[in-house]
């Protein structure tokens, strides 16, 4: 089982453990080996203490266990004699956050350890480009996050503050949308969402390329490159090429780095180069027609980054077509 947790040591027998919503975790506790072991894990809020898990007289005692912990906790029974009183905690919820005390008594001594459990969540955010009538918007969206993240925007690497923030979920987890109006701008934009508890940061970067003017029946090359500053070599990512038309996006091609599989939804679309180095995802669109005019969007996304590259293609009638008219 993969247990995601961060251990922070602080004085006075107190540890801070950070877990992720819905995942499992171990609350650590060790003691000097001794016989006649008694273990009581308790949760304490401002008003009360609740029995999480007890062990004495050689077996787990769950008669007085609080119902919220039913079937979610266990001890490492075969390691108790070695001084391990750690608690295995399943399916973390935000309500599990708080102070836990582990009481251990033996024939030699009795001790109490304190563990502070903090629970975080950070579902991979998204950066979306939207056109509404004549306006263009960038939206940074995180569907589920806790605690409240720090969201920052940059325009051409300079921090900016004008953004519209929408938040749902009063106690958490939160769903957050941060929207920036970029109508008429040729600047590049960057949105960073940081979960300080989980020490996780996601960055979305948007770049508008110069407009491309092409003739009917020609082909166009649309560049899209993976910037090494953003992506580490072993990181899984996906590439999506789509076309924006009347505010609606339709997918043209899709690539998954984990399987190295490409799916094309438009027969005139192909990679510029073989994807040997997996860094250049430029595309060719052949046999252009007037209806191919519009905005083309390349989206390279991983757990930590989204890179959006926009190309505006103008297809003009060829000379022959023009003279025929």
């Amino acid at each position: 089982i993969f247990l995601s947790a961060f251990f922070t040591y602080v004085p006075m027998n107190e540890q801070i453990i950070i877990g992720r919503l819905g995942e499992d975790i171990i609350l650590p506790s060790s003691f000097e080996r001794g016989s006649e072991v008694v273990i009581h894990w308790k949760y304490q809020d401002s008003y009360n203490s609740y029995n999480v898990h007890s062990y004495y007289k050689g077996s787990g005692r769950l008669e007085s266990q609080d119902t919220r912990y039913a079937n979610r906790t266990s001890l490492f029974y075969n390691e108790i004699q070695n001084g391990n009183a750690s608690l295995f905690f399943r399916r973390l919820s935000l309500l599990d956050e708080g102070i836990y005390t582990c009481y251990v008594g033996t024939a030699i001594q009795a001790i109490t350890n304190k563990v502070v459990l903090k629970v975080g969540v950070f579902l991979t955010p998204m950066m979306k480009y939207e056109k509404r009538n004549t306006n263009s918007f960038l939206i940074c969206n995180v569907l589920s996050v806790y605690p409240r993240p720090i969201i920052t925007w940059k325009m051409d690497n300079t921090p900016i503050s004008e953004n519209n923030m929408q938040e749902t979920g009063s106690l958490g987890p939160f769903s957050i949308n941060s929207t920036l109006n970029i109508t008429g701008s040729n600047s590049s934009y960057e949105c960073t969402i940081e979960n300080s508890l989980l020490k996780q940061t996601w960055t979305g970067r948007w770049t508008m390329k110069d407009g491309l003017h092409k003739m009917q029946s020609e082909h166009v090359s649309l560049s899209c490159e993976l910037v090494n500053d953003y992506f580490s070599p072993n990181q899984d990512f996906k590439v999506t090429w789509s076309r924006m038309e009347s505010g609606i996006s339709s997918i043209l091609a899709y690539y998954l780095s984990s399987s190295q599989n490409t799916t094309f939804y438009e027969s005139r679309f192909s990679w510029n180069k073989e994807l040997k180095n997996q860094s250049d995802f430029s595309m060719n669109l052949t046999d252009l027609s007037l209806s191919d005019s519009g905005e083309y969007l390349c989206n390279i996304s991983s757990d930590e980054y989204t890179l959006l590259t926009i190309h505006t293609v103008h297809v003009e009638p060829s000379q022959e077509t023009a003279s025929d008219n």
């Epitope: 016989s35 308790k42 008594g105 009795a110």
Partner: antibody
């Protein structure tokens, strides 16, 4: 070394109340369950009450249930037994006792006791 | 409630003797039994816990055995300091003491 010293005993009339105290030293009081045990001189021992290390659970012998209340003040390292509606059969030496931990375990240290006499 | 029956109630013996005190439970208490020694005017002192575990600092001439309902405390070679009253305690379900065995000099 572990020391338990009881006080508060005395002569009391039937139906009246009395509060016993036990001052603990030589160990981390808040880490141990504490009990009261009584003994009629020349007779046997009887367990009276238990309070868990954190005060979260309290248990009583049937003979005192509803009349006696066990409590603790960890900041003062003191155990208490509030006795009300006293009866002649409550006459005994009351001892404060430490459990080796806090899980219905055996007793490892006892105080000398304080005499309670219920008589009209 | 679990009843504890201790026997004999009085036992006369001499220094150097091997003596055995028995405790019987009214129902099984597994090994959750302790033995105590009490001298007049003094607090009881723990000798044995979990039926057979010797408390540290207690002389090895004391030993305990048994499980379920039958338990014994044995003093292999009586010393002058051992003359006292002995109690068993079950701690399987709440707490019950035996009525005590007074060990006196013959």
């Amino acid at each position: 070394q572990v020391q338990l010293v009881e006080s508060g005993g005395g002569v009391v009339q039937p139906g009246r109340s009395l509060r016993l105290s036990c001052a603990a030293s030589g160990f981390t009081f808040s880490n141990y369950a504490m009990h009261w045990v009584r003994q009629v001189p020349g007779k046997g021992l009887e367990w009276v009450a238990l309070i868990w290390y954190d005060g979260s659970e309290k248990y009583y012998a049937d003979s005192v249930k509803g009349r006696f209340t066990i409590s603790r003040d960890d900041s003062k390292n003191t155990l208490f037994l509030q006795m009300s509606s006293l009866r002649a059969e409550d006459t005994a030496v009351y001892s404060c006792v430490r459990e080796y931990s806090s899980g219905w375990g055996y007793f490892d240290y006892w105080g000398q006791g304080t005499q309670v006499t219920v008589s009209s | 409630d679990i009843q504890m029956t201790q026997s004999p109630s009085t036992l006369s013996a001499s220094v150097g003797d091997r003596v055995t005190i028995t405790c019987r439970a009214s129902q099984s208490i597994s090994s959750w039994l302790a033995w105590y020694q009490q001298k007049p005017g003094k607090a009881p002192k723990l000798l044995i816990y979990k039926a057979s575990s010797l408390k540290s600092g207690v002389p090895s001439r004391f030993s305990g055995s048994g499980s379920g309902t039958e338990f014994t405390l044995t003093i292999s070679s009586l010393q002058p300091d051992d003359f006292a009253t002995y109690y068993c305690l079950q701690y399987n379900s709440y707490y019950t003491f035996g009525q005590g065995t007074k060990l006196e000099i013959k």
